[in-house]
Structure formats: structure tokens, C-alpha cells
Interface confidence: low
Amino acid sequence: GCLTQLYENAFFRGGDVASMYTPNAQYCQMRCTFHPRCLLFSFLPASSINDMEKRFGCFLKDSVTGTLPKVHRTGAVSGHSLKQCGHQISACHRDIYKGVDMRGVNFNVSKVSSVEECQKRCTSNIRCQFFSYATQTFHKAEYRNNCLLKYSPGGTPTAIKVLSNVESGFSLKPCALSEIGCHMNIFQHLAFSDVDVARVLTPDAFVCRTICTYHPNCLFFTFYTNVWKIESQRNVCLLKTSESGTPSSSTPQENTISGYSLLTCKRTLPEPCHSKIYPGVDFGGEELNVTFVKGVNVCQETCTKMIRCQFFTYSLLPEDCKEEKCKCFLRLSMDGSPTRIAYGTQGSSGYSLRLCNTGDNSVCTTKTSTR
Amino acid sequence: IVGGTNSSWGEWPWQVSLQVKLTAQRHLCGGSLIGHQWVLTAAHCFDGLPLQDVWRIYSGILNLSDITKDTPFSQIKEIIIHQNYKVSEGNHDIALIKLQAPLNYTEFQKPICLPSKGDTSTIYTNCWVTGWGFSKEKGEIQNILQKVNIPLVTNEECQKRYQDYKITQRMVCAGYKEGGKDACKGDSGGPLVCKHNGMWRLVGITSWGEGCARREQPGVYTKVAEYMDWILEKTQSSDGKAQMQSPA
């Protein structure tokens, strides 16, 4: 189920799958929600630790049991991923942080009159992930009203420093507030060039596009279909970026499909989940559980309810069925995508709906924080 | 909203505008989306206009002037007014609207979480009231959704300010001693939300007040936590699953 309570002065021991710098616990929680394996997180505000390297540290954690031992740590904040939390799942983060400088690659500097204007510029720049703004009272006169647009390899700051008269925040592209607009077109038999930022396996180009949309550095993608000539590259989804923000070249290529991230769409973004079920397809991955259920939809529901489950395969092989119920293989991987996609099998596969934000899950569960 | 500022897109995605289409169309009240098919508002919004056909509910909007004849709106399937609401009193000023068709959630249109039943222990320090209502007592409906940060006031303090009215434990008050910031006409039914532990909760429903933003005259809101049983009972569908965002 959905758990939204935060634990103050508590830190989860062990289970680390990733770490990064975030300005507050809520942003850390959002990163945990969108990380394929993160179930729990712990955050260290600047006030909670003397070690400068660990200030603003956000630690993403996994656990086979869904929980980890809590240790007392003054000022630390811990909590749960919001996977399975329906409409609370959003990559949109509006907060502006005063007295904080979020570090990254500064690729654009301009003079603006307010921090809101700076955030708007970041939102309207295809490469900007976060920004810092030096206010009117910044100690160095030449930097006053400077708006620095930034990015980093992981989409989060490479460091966060406490600095007076500086305000920082994130792009509002995930809030569907970009003025850039987006390309909805899918280009058949076309491959894009430029830098690959990640490689995942997907059953179709639409899943590839959604993954690109929610990847911090993906601006466009190329998908190689299941009939692509090189077997080892079939169902490969290449997430790409470029200096200019658009592909520098494209090559006509049979059995490839290309397209763009939808992060810059106005007013509507795709859900960060994939609801389609793929008949005759087997998704390979690490086995989480096997259960007998009646029908592929129930298999998907079972996967969705099991928070660690990322995708599933429902087998219709006679040896995998007992009366009306057949085996439902609940699976996971390091990146949330299948490690293998096989065709012509007796069964169907699909993804967990744990990140769908239209669920009517009881997403507002609250328990008193332990203090 | 008196003393407020413009909101931005998707800042309050649960806020809806309840409009009446008679000869002309006008915004009458606010409301809060609490589920795909449910809006929570004030009972008094329907005083004399309880026929569902005349109402149009606009969600996912920021600027009322953007509404045209082509703007999609929701229609009402059912109005459920609290059984103890009496128009002669300010008590139980709460109503549920069931929409004819469920709404999809987007960044600009999604529900607000409800508080826990009888939530009295939480100390809310970051509360906001939103709406398109008057910006002064003798004002007019605003085009852009307004927001204002207002502190909660104890019921004891509130009762002192309203000697002629009974401030019950099922009401919550908010305002500044010096006035200047408040809800006003046209904000009724809309949300008083508070952010706690990073999560927004619907603490109150804009209900009434003496004038708007007057000194020592806080706004009075229906306390949602006190009506959780009623909300859950009324929103339970036939399969027994709550159709709104509620505490477990």
C-alpha cells in the first residue's frame, strides 16, 4: 500500500541502491519514487551533519522485506517511496530554496529580475534541469540578478552548498509547464544519431518514449524493433541527447523507430507507467515470486500490489496451469526494464502499474510521525 | 480572496470552479476535487439552486476568462448536502458533488488528500486559501485563481470574535488579527489547505465570515476532519471501495 509518513530524526540502515544530493526530503522522496528499485529513503539536511560531503545527502534504499532498521540520527528525515500512491506520483517539484546553491554544469547565464523569472527560463530551456539565482543582495555586485541554468549527468545537483542571497530550484517541465512544446510524432524506419545516455529493453517504441520522457537526460530516442537484423539489438531502446537539444542527423533505417521526449509538452505528460499487456511475449528478469492466478489482468494486479514487482509474465503453458489458474511470474531488474524479451511464447507480459497516477489507491495514508 | 496573489498553473490542481448557467454563466463557488468523480464544497452554494442541470464544474483551470463555450466541463450526477445542514444556521456547511463522468488526473487536475478522522493533534503552520472570489468586500469575481497564506486561529479565539454565532468544534477559523487577508464572496466551498510533512491536506471548506478580511473577524471554515465518516459513507460505491482520496 501507500505510505506517506515521514520519520524525523531517523535514518534507515543499509539497503543503499543510489545516492545523490537533493535540497529537501520531499525531492529525495520523489527521486526514490521514480527509481526502479527504491522503496525507502533517508535524507540528511545541512543541519543534521558536519561532514560537508554528506550534507543534503539523499540515500535511496531497497529491501527484500520492504523495511529496514531505523537508527536515531538527529535532524535526519526518512520515509517511503510513493510507488503505489496514485495521484501523489509526480515528478513536478515547484519549491524554491532560499540560501541554497545547487551546483551543476552552468551552461547559460543571464540577468533576470526575479527567481520566478529564472525558474521560467529554466523551464523553457530544453537542457535545463535546475537553476540558481543570485538575488539583489548577493555579496558580489557583478553576480546580482544572475540566473544560472544548469544540468548534471543524473539530473540532480552535483553538490549543494549553503550560500546567502542565492535561491535555487528545479525546472518545471515535469509540471507540464514548458513553453517549448513537444513533438508527438513517431518516425518509422528512422534512426537518430548523437550521444546515447542509456540503453534499455522495451517491447515497443511507446514504452521507450515514456522511459525517455522520465529520464533526466533523454531528449530523443531510437528503438530497434523485434525484427531488427541484429538479434542482440532487437527491442533495444536507446535514450539520446545532444548539445543542441535536437538530433544532429537521422538515418533512414528499416525496423527502427525514433521520436522525442515528451517532457516539454504543454499541459499534459504521459503517465510514468505502461499499462499495455503484450500477448505472446516473455519478459525476462530476476524472479521475485511465482503465483497461480486466474487471467493476465489479475497477474498484472498482483504485480502492481507487490511493490518490488516491476514487470510480469503470465504463462499459458499446460504445465504452468491448474484448472483455470496459471502461473504468474513476478519479476524485477536493476533498471526496471526486462533483461530479455522473447517472442512466440504461450503467455503474455506487461508492467506493474505502481507508478500510474490514476489509481484510486488510498494514497493519503498518514500515521503519526515518530519523533 | 483578499490580500492574495495570482496562482500559477497546476499549483492547486484540486481547485474547481462551480458555475451556474442560467441566462448568463457565472462563477458562484469553489470546490475541491477529492476523487475521480467527487468534489467537496459548501452546502450553502446550493441554497436556492440545487437543481444539478444548471451547474457546470470546471477543473484544471487557472483563468476564468479562458473559459469559452468549447471549454470542457463536468456536470453533476448527484448533490449530497449534509443531512443536518440548515440554511438558517452556519453548521454542517458541507456538500458532496458526484460528477456524471470520472475525471482523469493530470498535473493540473488531481485530488487533494483528506485529513484523518477527527484530526486534532496535527499543528498546521502552513495554510492557504484559494479561489476566484472577490478581492474586497464590494468587489468582483477575479479572473486568475488567487491564493493567500493565512494562519489558523483557535476556536476559543474565534468564538470571542463572533459572539453572536456558535463556533463549533466542527468549524475551523483562519485569519490575521489585523485582517487584510481572507476569503471572500465567491470563494465559498473552496479549499483551505495546509502542508504538513510535505503533503497538502484539505483542512477546511470556505464557509462564512463577517465581511471580508476585517480586523479581528477571521474566516470560518467547515472542518473536514470532523466529517470524514460522513464523506466516506457517502462516497462508498456499491463495491465498497472509497472513490476518493482518504486516509486508510
Epitope: - | D47, P50, V54, Y165, G186
Partner: antibody, heavy 122, light 106 residues
Amino acid sequence: EVQLLESGGGLVQPGGSLRLSCAASGFTFSHYIMMWVRQAPGKGLEWVSGIYSSGGITVYADSVKGRFTISRDNSKNTLYLQMNSLRAEDTAVYYCAYRRTGIPRRDAFEIWGQGTMVTVSS
Amino acid sequence: DIQMTQSPSTLSASVGDRVTITCRASQSISSWLAWYQQKPGKAPNLLIYKASTLESGVPSRFSGSGSGTEFTLTISSLQPDDFATYYCQQYNTYWTFGQGTKVEIK
């Protein structure tokens, strides 16, 4: 004491005009939906028109639509009914009444004035 | 438009009688119905609203019931002060009155 006092009634010829006023006192006028209701001699009550507290919404009975205009001046605590193109069948006692939309609130017409007589005759 | 039909038009009764007046709406009005009492030369006086809620200060011998399209006003024991004309009024869509029921001395 809560009071509504209508004025402006009288004798008028068919096709003529008349403006009725209703002065309110003893309550916060701007909180209320105000109404005009009429009663022809020896007949029942007929709702004529209503205006919401801000004055933004006005509604009329079919029988007077296009001929009568309801308005209010919240600063003067006064309700008006401008009656044009008057007909013999408009002859009646005209009452103003209120329904509160502020605090406390009421469903039906709560307080009525004593009425003003309008006679349309040649 | 919603029409309201009251019956009977006239009712003759004696002090102490139980009196029932019926009001029928041309379409469902839920519980959005009020009852008024009017005496000659006077403005109407609200007795009951929301079909069954007694207005403060109104004697408990008056009661209302019904919902949808059928409503009744009952005076459990008629008093000398109760001889008057009674009107029902819907406020589901705009406002419409019934034609009235005159309660007179038998």
C-alpha cells in the same frame, strides 16, 4: 430590528413604467439573495425575480422576462425592480423578501416586507 | 418550469381538528420545499423549509413531510390562530408557489 420596506407602487397606465424600491435595515444586506414576489388581488403568490448577493446573477419568471429588471445597490442597502411595458395582469401587491447566503443561512424566503400595491389600468 | 399543485383549494375545519394539505410538484424537487402561512392583508410567514424543518418560533403542531414530488403539511390540532391561507413553494429551480389552500372555520 430586521426590516424590509417597499415603496414606489401606484397607478400606472398599460405600457407605462414604474420603479419599485425596497430599503433593508437590521441585517447585512450584501449577504443575501433578494427576491420580488407578487400577489394579484384575491390570487396566490407568484415569484417574480431574484438577485444574488453580489448582483452578478439575476433570474426572472417567464411572465416578466424582458420587461422587468432587478438590481441592487449594496452600499445603499436597497433592492430595485424596474418595471417596463406594464400590463393589466401585472396589477398586484409586490413584496420584497430575502434569503441569506452569508451567516446564518436559510433555504426559503426568510423575511418579507409588507408590500407595495401596483395598479395597471387605463 | 416546475408547477406546484396544492389540494384542496379550500378546507373547512374546526378548532382541534387534524388538518392535512397536500402539494404535488410536476417533477422531482428532492426536499426543496417550503410552506408559508398568510393572513389577509399581511405578508406570508415561513413555517417549514426543506420539506420538514420547522422554522424557529413556529408551533410544533405544524409539521411537514415528503420528498420528490409529494409533500404534505399537517396541523395536528387546529387552533383559532391557524385559520389562514397556506402556500407551498419549491426552490429546486428558481421559485414557484402552489395556488394556495384556504383553511376556514366550518
